[in-house]
């Protein structure tokens, strides 16, 4: 929040904001930073002690249509010998993202913002042990 | 959502592309099943590659707050609770879509923006470069 956007040294007057019908917002879906690439460490999904696979979900009425989801390969974690250690747990790490949903109602179409939970990868954790009384 | 009338006759041929600008309902639909037992808040401490969370604030963005992960160690925590530098803690990064106010400071006009966030950390075997 502390960093102002470069080139905007003045504040918009409300009258210079585009008119928007009540209860809605104007959304330009031309993505800023569309071509930036993830500079994640190389193939960490295979090198992790809690490795994961990726699957692509496709929905033509969602923007973006493609959403990539990760699934942990194992319940346990991979030890130094390359074997699964079930005394540890592979668990999914999740993050919310926004998508635009296109809805058809008869011959009309409407658009709705949606929060989607994406599984990003997995991490290896010490299990929580519940002691039975 | 905000309803936009289709062409007269309502043809079957479906426009596959989204229009560049859309009017969307201010209410955000939540697809997330919050009963998911895997959504645990303590992985950041229990992980062999633990991380700290930092609150990133930006009023020109929606959501205005995003929590970012930073790995605590270069190495990973071993069975004895010590940092093992033969393994590496690395951030798991994800591109997410957020809304950016456009023009700036306008309450109900946005543009989609792709940002890269670190969500957590994972423990990996290092890439060893052998010098010839």
């Amino acid at each position: 929040r502390k960093i102002p956007k470069v080139g905007h040294t003045f504040f918009q007057k409300p009258e210079s904001c585009p008119p928007v019908p009540g209860g809605s917002m104007k959304l330009d879906i031309g993505i800023i930073n569309e071509n930036q690439r993830v500079s994640m460490s190389r193939n960490i999904e295979s090198r992790s002690t809690s490795p994961w696979n990726y699957t692509v979900t496709w929905d033509p009425n969602r923007y973006p249509s493609e959403v990539v989801q990760a699934q942990c390969r194992n319940l346990g974690c991979i030890n130094a010998q390359g074997k699964e250690d079930i005394s540890m747990n592979s668990v999914p790490i999740q993050q919310e993202t926004l998508v635009v949903r296109r809805k058809h109602q008869g011959c009309s179409v409407s658009f709705q913002l949606e929060k989607v939970l994406v599984t990003v990868g997995c991490t290896c954790v010490t299990p929580v042990i519940h002691h039975v009384q | 959502g905000i309803t936009i009338p289709r062409n007269p006759g309502c043809p079957n041929s479906e426009d596959k592309n989204f229009p560049r600008t859309v009017m969307v309902n201010l209410n955000i639909h939540n697809r997330n099943t919050n009963t998911n037992p895997k959504r645990s808040s303590d992985y950041y401490n229990r992980s062999t590659s633990p991380w700290n969370l930092h609150r990133n604030e930006d009023p020109e963005r929606y959501p205005s707050v995003i929590w970012e992960a930073k790995c605590r160690h270069l190495g990973c925590i071993n069975a004895d609770g010590n940092v093992d530098y033969h393994m590496n803690s690395v951030p798991i990064q994800q591109e997410i879509l957020v809304l950016r106010r456009e023009p700036p400071h306008c309450p109900n006009s946005f543009r989609l923006e792709k940002i890269l966030v670190s969500v957590g950390c994972t423990c990996v075997t290092p890439i060893v470069h052998h010098v010839a």
Partner: antibody, heavy 119, light 107 residues
Framework: EVQLVQSGAEVKKPGASVKVSCKAS????????FHWVRQAPGQGLEWMGV????????AYNQNFRDRVTITADKSTSTAYMELSSLRSEDTAVYYC????????????WGQGTLVTVSS | EIVMTQSPATLSVSPGERATLSCKAS??????VGWFQQKPGQSPRLLIY???NRYTGVPARFSGSGSGTDFTLTISSLQPEDFAVYFC?????????FGQGTKLEIK
Amino acid sequence: EVQLVQSGAEVKKPGASVKVSCKASGYTFTDYEFHWVRQAPGQGLEWMGVIHPGNGGTAYNQNFRDRVTITADKSTSTAYMELSSLRSEDTAVYYCARFLTYEGYFDYWGQGTLVTVSS
Amino acid sequence: EIVMTQSPATLSVSPGERATLSCKASQSVSIDVGWFQQKPGQSPRLLIYHASNRYTGVPARFSGSGSGTDFTLTISSLQPEDFAVYFCQQDYSSPYTFGQGTKLEIK
């Protein structure tokens, strides 16, 4: 209906600690941040810190950093604020407030907990 | 930290009249300002968020304006239940800060 119900009034001696609770109901506890704000008698409001119960992240006002700890228990949908090394100037009403992290504003507040520090 | 300064400290207005409360930020806070009403023995109640958006259930007589450093809360026609203390607050950057309050009293 969203409700934030705080624990009852406390009287503490200087140097002691106090732990105030805030139980949430009527929404998914892990979806929103919890902030703690205090108000000394006849004074304005002072932000103390925040926790996100969904990921465990915390952030504190530097003025309290060494003395305040904010935690959350997902099993009971309760947030806690513990303030240590109490002094007389910590006498105040302590509020928890829900913060909408997407929209960026406080919407619901607890009823407040009066903490009196007196020898 | 950002300092929020409210004026006046006390405002005496007759019921039915208009009340204008001011809030100044020590640096630009965009539109990230909220206004709260507080009555004795009660917790703050949100009236306005993002400088000019009326919160759900808040009467139309309450309106907010401003951006950058100068913000105003206007109550168009004061009702008996409106006499209270009003706080402005910025959540542009943490630590989030509040004004010291304006006490709105019956003239």
